[in-house]
Each structure stands twice: as C-alpha cells, then as structure tokens.
C-alpha cells in the first residue's frame, strides 16, 4: 500500500509540485492530526501558509480562547488557522511572517518579520518577532517585546481593562497596543474614528479600520 504524503506547511505543498492557490490539508508536526489551510502559491514566490484573513466581515472574530486555539472560519474566506498549530509549526524551524494590508482607498502595504514564532499554550501563545521590514510602518504595530495572546475569556494583556472586550477579537494585546487585525469589521465610509476596528497603527493611525488583512508564514529558508 502506498504511503500517503503529509505536509506540515504550504512550503512543503509547493515543493511537492502543487503550485496552485487553494485549500490544502496540513498535518501537525509529529502527529497525525490534520488541519485545513489556505496556501498562497503565487505571492512572493509562493509557499505561504495563510494563518489569518479578513476581507468582508462575514466571520465573527470575537471568539473564545479555545476557538482561537483550534481555529475558526473558512480557509477560502475569513478565518483564523489556529494558535496551537501555528505554535507547534513555528517552533519546529525558523519562519517568517508577512502581514499584507489593504485600506479603503486602494492602497496596499505589508510588514515582514524575518523571524516569527508563538510560545506554547502554557505561555499563552506569546508572540515573538524580529527583523521588521516593509511598507506598513517603520515601527512594529505589534508591540515589542511580544505579548501574550488574549481573548474575551482569556485576559492576558497588561491593561487594567480587558482589551479583548474593549477592542473585540483575540490578539497579542498590550495596553492595548498599536494593532488588532481581529477587531470589528467596518464597511467603507464607516471605517474611521473606530477604536475597536481592524487596526495597524503605524500605517493608518489609531481610528482607521482596514478593508482587508492577511497574515502568512513561510520557512525562512524557503
């Protein structure tokens, strides 16, 4: 019987000859557990595993710790891949993180971190980032050093408030910090002066809620 090939990430999918954008089944490192992810095989050389996407407000991102852990939404549209998978994956080898952003005026920008990983659940999926380049601000809109992940039922931020309740969505909040790509989705002409929107401060400022965001990862040695 032929052994079924399993892929840890979209880079492995790409290298196996699958070079079309789409949903692929990935396998947790050192496990048989599977997860469906969207693979971008075109942008910047391909092989990108999409870990977050916002584009139309069709999915509620005000979710529980468990939902952010295992993932939610639809990989073909708005979704969160899952903190546990991303944590395990990014602790296996060095990954880069690219965050692609679109505003409502037709502009696009990105932030690229040359090293990205998430701590384990025991350490609240704390984000670790190094080496920022890109067009979405010279200062990182994800606070450095990285913060623990927080959700509406898992308050790990530094704020006296509960950032996830104030700003909505799960994120690596500080107090509450310069970004939240999992905030409320506001349509065009309702997207300004919103403290709880989809924010990337060092590109668009504090009250601007973005039109679309994508967070994607790929091995650094791809």
């Amino acid at each position: 019987k032929e052994e079924q090939i399993s892929f840890r990430d979209c880079a492995e999918v790409f290298k196996s000859g699958h070079t079309t954008n789409g949903i692929y089944t990935l396998t947790f490192p050192n496990s048989t557990e599977e997860i469906k992810a969207y693979c971008d095989m075109e942008a910047g050389g391909g092989g990108w595993t999409i870990i977050q996407r916002r584009e139309d407000g069709s999915v509620d991102f005000q979710r529980t710790w468990k939902e952010y852990k295992v993932g939610f939404g639809n990989p073909s549209g708005e979704y969160w891949l899952g903190n546990e998978f991303v944590s395990q994956l990014t602790n296996q080898q060095r990954y880069v993180l690219k965050i692609h952003l679109k505003d409502w005026e037709g502009n696009e920008a990105y932030s690229l971190y040359e090293h990205f990983y998430l701590s384990s659940e025991e350490l609240n999926y704390r984000i670790h980032l190094k080496g920022l380049t890109g067009t979405a601000g010279k200062i990182s809109s994800i606070s450095q050093p990285g913060n623990d992940f927080s959700t509406k039922d898992g308050d790990n931020d530094k704020c006296i408030c509960k950032c996830s309740q104030m700003l909505t969505g799960g994120w690596w909040f500080d107090a509450c910090g310069p970004s939240n790509l999992n905030g409320m989705y506001y349509p065009q002409r309702q997207n300004t002066n919103k403290f709880n929107g989809i924010k990337w401060y060092y590109w668009k400022g504090s009250g601007y809620s973005l039109k679309a965001t994508t967070m994607m990862i790929r091995p650094a040695d791809f």
Partner: antibody, heavy 120, light 108 residues
Framework: EVQLVESGGGLVQPGGSLRLSCAAS????????IHWVRQAPGKGLEWVAG????????YYADSVKGRFTISADTSKNTAYLQMNSLRAEDTAVYYC?????????????WGQGTLVTVSS | DIQMTQSPSSLSASVGDRVTITCRAS???????VAWYQQKPGKAPKLLIY???SLYSGVPSRFSGSGSGTDFTLTISSLQPEDFATYYC?????????FGQGTKVEIK
C-alpha cells in the same frame, strides 16, 4: 442622581490609621470601578488605589502598597480605603471616583473629597 | 510606570484666546484610555474629554481633544472666564493609573 460622598478624614498622628468611606448613590458600585485619588496641598492629582467588581481585583500605587487597602461592601453600596502606617506625605484631600470600564473609559463622577492630615 | 508629561505647566491667556495643552505618554497608549479633567480651586476634578477625543456629556463644544499613540492634546477654541482652572491628562490603562502634573490656565 449620581453621588459619591467621602467621609472618615481627619487629623491623625504618624504611624496611625484611618478608614475612609465612599458612599455611592444613584448607581450600583457592582457596575463600575471605584478609585481613590488624592491631592496634597498645592499639588497635582495622584491616583492611590482602585477596586474592580469582577473578582474584586484591587490595584495600588507603589507609594501606598502594603499600607493601604481598598475594599467595598456591595450591600451598602460603599467603598472603603483603610489607611495604616500613615506618614506626613499622605496628607492630602482624598477623592473617590467612579470609573466607567467601557465608554467613557474614565472617572466620570467624583466625590467632594475628605481631608486627611498626618501630623504630630 | 507610564509617565504623562504635560506642557506647559502654566500659561496666561485672555478671554477669547485659543489654548492648547499637550500631554506626552512615555509609551504607546490606546486612545480610548486617555482622558482630560478640569479642576477649580477647592473643587473635585470634572471629566472633559474621554477616549482622547470624545467630548463628555454637558461639556461645552469649545473643548476638544485629539492625538493618538503617545501624543495627546486638549484645545480650548475660545477661552471663557469660567475656563480658568487647572487641567490634567490621565491614562487609565496600566496600573498605576497616572495623571499629568497639571496645567494651570491663568488670566493674562
């Protein structure tokens, strides 16, 4: 009508204790945070301590940590500030304030203040 | 601790003047956590602005707030006699909560 009324201030010797009360009316303290803020004569505002109803979390300024205790009796709709080991530098008008923990995320109502004088 | 550095510490102005007070935080603050208060001698402070730029109920529209990140501003567009007072910025996000040192607005 929302009201906060402080009481319990007065003259006390260094090392002594006082208990300030903040009686709330027109709202229930279970729905708000309560903070104590003080103002030394001729000086600016200094936050002292805060109490949150969810889990009864308490927060303190470093200058009073270990000496002051903030608490609340929700059945009496009253917050308290127990002040021990008082020092001359604790001399101030003490205000209690209601803090809204959504919007406006700020101290929207204040009491009239009660004067605490620490002197021998 | 977050320092809230206010400037100027005092200013003299005339009725009708436009007055601007600035407050710089020592680290990035979400704007919803920044407030401005007015205090007159012998009285408790009063909330003017919350969320850095939102006018509190009952406060005259000549008061406005702006800013984000680390730099915040209170503006009085046309100073009135009753506006002579001391103004404080405050952050309510991190413990300890901190106030600016105050700006005393005096009559020229």
């Amino acid at each position: 009508e929302v009201q906060l009324v402080e009481s319990g201030g007065g003259l006390v010797q260094p090392g002594g204790s006082l208990r300030l009360s903040c009686a709330a009316s027109g709202f229930t303290i279970m729905d708000y945070w309560i903070h104590w803020v003080r103002q030394a004569p001729g000086k600016g505002l200094e936050w002292v301590a805060g109490w949150t109803p969810a889990g009864g979390y308490t927060y303190y300024a470093d200058s009073v940590k270990g000496r002051f205790t903030i608490s609340a009796d929700t059945s009496k709709n009253t917050a308290y500030l127990q002040m021990n080991s008082l020092r001359a530098e604790d001399t101030a008008v003490y205000y209690c304030a209601r803090f809204v923990f959504f919007l406006p995320y700020a101290m929207d109502y204040w009491g009239q203040g009660t004067l605490v004088t620490v002197s021998s | 601790d977050i320092q809230m550095t206010q400037s100027p510490s005092s200013l003299s102005a005339s009725v009708g003047d436009r007055v601007t007070i600035t407050c710089r935080a020592s680290q990035f603050l979400s704007s919803f956590g920044v407030a401005w208060y007015q205090q007159k001698p012998g009285k408790a402070p009063k909330l003017l602005i919350y969320g850095a730029s939102s006018l509190y109920s009952g406060v005259p529209s000549r008061f406005s707030g702006s800013g984000s990140g680390t730099d915040f501003t209170l503006t009085i567009s046309s100073l009135q006699p009753e506006d002579f007072a001391t103004y404080y910025c405050q952050q309510g996000l991190l413990s300890p909560l901190t106030f600016g040192q105050g700006t005393k607005v005096e009559i020229k």
